[in-house]
């Protein structure tokens, strides 16, 4: 960067190299070049020479003034015009940054995605700071009172193996940068209450041509949680609004859910689950499309998801193989 150059003088910023966005700032340049009494001192921002707001303070020093500086980052350097020198001589350079102090982190959330082996903590960091902002996540056992701290730039994954202080913890987040520091409220968690079940996946669909045709959606999860509540939402692809069906689910077997749908329409399905009575939902599963036939029974499986469908007899089973256990996304 610009800060690595060999200097023949000094450049500095007032009030500081990192300052609050929108401030008025002064950049000073002082030459210390052998056998050179500078005729003129020049300032460059991101390689472009500045023409205005430059004041000569004395024989070796000049000041560049900016009003309401709004750029997050800029590389500044200054040069001197020396007598008997054809080119300008570089004096020194500096990277400057403007931004904001951090907001108070809020909406601190910690979840354990089943099979991840981690507790994932996230928070709303507030407005963009534009400058390097670090977060310290504090995890304090309510049983042993032992506190662990984790430094991060965004969210944090904490191995559940490192949570040796029982099941109950306080979690809070400190945000800090060059312009300030803020601390969130404390979140109390119980490890058993924050588990999000392994992702539910729709594996196939079939429409059975009975007197009233019905569509069966097959879906499953590898969860080891015995009491799970799920929602399946579905709509015609041409519609805006979703229909939602709720289920108390027992994943000791692959689930089969029945729907009475309009013929010859393309539908989209998604499913999500949570441990019954707990707070956090899985993200919605990926979109699963199924076009109902006019009259002929049909099966749609993951293998046939490119808007194709089978006519003929309904298929008794389609192998699903392993379900992925680490699918994750936003918390519902």
């Amino acid at each position: 960067g610009i800060t690595n150059i060999n200097c023949s003088g000094h450049i500095w910023v007032e009030p500081a190299t990192i300052f609050k966005m929108g401030m008025n700032i002064s950049i000073y340049c002082q030459a210390a070049i052998k056998n050179c009494q500078p005729r003129k001192l020049h300032f460059y921002k991101n390689g472009i020479k500045e023409r205005f707001q430059i004041t000569r303070i004395n024989k070796t020093t000049a000041r560049l003034w900016y009003k309401n500086f709004l750029e997050p980052h800029a590389s500044m350097y200054c040069t001197a015009e020396c007598p008997k020198h054809f080119q300008e001589t570089l004096i020194c350079g500096k990277d400057i940054s403007s931004g904001y102090p951090p907001d108070i982190p809020d909406e601190v959330t910690c979840v354990i995605y089943e099979y991840s082996g981690n507790m994932t903590c996230t928070w709303n960091a507030g407005k963009l700071t534009y400058i390097d902002t670090k977060y310290v996540v504090h995890v304090k056992s309510l049983e042993t009172e032992e506190e662990q701290q984790y430094l991060t730039s965004s969210y944090i994954n904490i191995s559940t193996d490192s949570l040796q202080g029982g099941k109950k913890y306080l979690v809070w987040v400190q945000a800090a940068n060059a312009l300030g520091m803020e601390e969130s409220k404390q979140l109390q968690i119980h490890l058993d209450d924050i588990v999000i079940p392994s992702a539910a996946v729709i594996s196939r669909a079939e429409t059975i041509n009975a007197t009233v045709p019905k569509t069966i959606i097959y879906w499953d999860s590898q969860t080891t949680i015995e009491k799970v509540s799920c929602e399946m939402r579905y709509k015609a692809t041409t519609n805006q609004t979703w229909n939602v069906k709720e289920f108390d689910t027992n994943f000791t077997y692959v689930q089969q859910s029945e729907f009475y749908l309009e013929p010859n329409i393309k539908y989209v399905f998604q499913v999500r689950c949570q441990e019954t009575g707990k707070r956090y939902w899985q993200p919605w599963s990926s979109l699963f499309f199924h076009k109902t036939p006019e009259t002929v029974p049909q099966v749609t499986s993951k293998a046939f998801q490119h808007d194709t469908w089978n006519s003929g007899l309904t298929v008794a089973s389609i192998s699903t193989g392993h379900l992925t256990s680490d699918n994750r996304g936003d918390i519902g």
């Epitope: 499953d220 080891t224 994943f251 000791t252 077997y253």
Partner: antibody, heavy 118, light 107 residues
């Protein structure tokens, strides 16, 4: 791939305790799944004995509840079976296994044969 | 406890035959039934779970069907390496229980 390996004594005297170890490689037993003990008697009959969940909670076959304990050592990635007050009826091949979600057992150890005899 | 009954202790077959093994649960287990293959000196190997779902890597000549209390495991074209004991198991709830096994042997 996940591997499970049982180890323990071949011979146990009646009224004593039977202790077996299952060592799991390539998957942390604290990360997920239920970890089971199943035994197979001479003549092929299989009996589910119990499991330890990745969180550490346990579930035992009621027919063995007064005699069985399943524990674990997370630092060694091992889980253990202790069966107290054994009789000759406990002579069997003992398997440890991992459960596929809440469904079937997808990974099994190769089994260890235990004879109860004086 | 849920009792799983495999009525045939032995079944005779020839290479290329289609063979079906049945298993009956003493109460409704929806589709929570698995099938295992066990060869001499080996541990059981999972073939089918949830009545009809082939486990990863299992050849498609092996299929399962049924729901409620009656379940069937079928090998569409028996290979020599399929000679083994086949067990059903209910995974509907604990205590998990197994059938007594059906030994597939050559005629």
């Amino acid at each position: 791939d996940v591997q499970l390996q049982e180890s323990g004594p071949d011979l146990v005297k009646p009224s004593q305790s039977l202790s077996l170890t299952c060592t799991v490689t390539d998957y942390s037993i604290t990360r997920g799944y239920n970890w089971h003990w199943i035994r197979q008697f001479p003549g092929n009959k299989l009996e589910w004995m119990g499991y330890i969940h990745y969180s550490g909670s346990t579930n035992y076959n009621p027919s063995l509840k007064s005699r069985i304990s399943i524990t674990r050592d997370t630092s060694k990635n091992q889980f253990f079976l202790q069966l107290n007050s054994v009789t000759t009826e406990d002579t069997a091949t003992y398997y440890c296994a991992r459960q596929y979600g809440l469904k079937a057992m997808d990974y099994w150890g190769q089994g260890t044969s235990v004879t109860v005899s004086s | 406890d849920i009792v799983m009954t495999q009525s045939h202790k032995f079944m005779s077959t020839s290479v290329g035959d289609r063979v079906s093994i049945t298993c009956k649960a003493s109460q409704d287990v929806i589709t929570a039934v698995a099938w295992y293959q066990q060869k001499p000196g080996q541990s059981p190997k999972l073939l089918i779970y949830s009545a009809s779902y082939r486990y990863t890597g299992v050849p498609d000549r092996f299929t399962g069907s049924g729901s409620g209390t009656d379940f069937t495991f079928t090998i569409s074209s028996v290979q020599a390496e399929d000679l083994a004991v086949y067990f059903c198991q209910q995974h509907f709830g604990t205590p998990y229980t197994f059938g007594s096994g059906t030994k597939l042997e050559m005629k």
